[in-house]
Interface confidence: medium
Amino acid sequence: QPDAINAPVTCCYNFTNRKISVQRLASYRRITSSKCPKEAVIFKTIVAKEICADPKQKWVQDSMDHLDKQTQTPKT
């Protein structure tokens, strides 16, 4: 049997067609191509909805940067 068979990997087959406002985004995770059909970013919104997005699009990259900065602990 394949390794990690009891831990199925979530995949993206299609990407959202519309840009999502960063104010609606809570977090993200990357999906790698070795386990799924496409490399993808899965955004989780503030209402816990998950949406697949294209990591090559600038708005997706900008949104990830924004979320990264949000999660960094503030320097005192």
Epitope: V9, C11, Y13, I51
Partner: nanobody, 125 residues
Framework: EVQLVESGGGLVQAGGSLRLSCAAS????????MGWFRQAPGKEREFVAA????????YYADSVKGRFTISRDNAKNTVYLLMNSLNPEDTAVYYC??????????????????WGQGTQVTVSS
């Protein structure tokens, strides 16, 4: 519960072809993607190809594009993987898997959580 049974593996010379079949049973597959993965000894499982059961959209790993073709026969609940121009690097156990898709096309799937037992493909040089 979903059952997946692969067949069609075997030994083939480099440059040859094989067609793998995956017969699915146990429930309705209208909202599934059916995928083929492979695992060579000592290596990680690797995505090969997938097809959406509902609309027939296909997806391929870069390493097999132009050589492998995935297709489906809805009437037989069977998915096929036609493998042409095989080379020794394609040697692996090939697994069929089912991935439950979300209603929203842009939502992530649940993940490949149903698997067949695998069929061995050996390509000799």
């Amino acid at each position: 519960e979903v059952q997946l049974v692969e067949s069609g593996g075997g030994l083939v010379q480099a440059g040859g072809s094989l067609r793998l079949s995956c017969a699915a049973s146990g429930r309705t597959f209208s909202n599934y993607a059916m995928g083929w993965f492979r695992q060579a000894p000592g290596k990680e499982r690797e995505f090969v190809a997938a097809i959406s059961w509902s609309d027939g959209s296909t997806y391929y790993a870069d390493s097999v594009k132009g050589r492998f073709t995935i297709s489906r026969d809805n009437a037989k609940n069977t998915v096929y993987l036609l493998m042409n121009s095989l080379n020794p690097e394609d040697t692996a156990v090939y697994y069929c898997a089912a991935d439950l898709l979300a209603e929203d096309p842009a939502a992530p799937s649940r993940g490949y959580d149903y698997w067949g037992q695998g069929t061995q493909v050996t390509v000799s040089s």
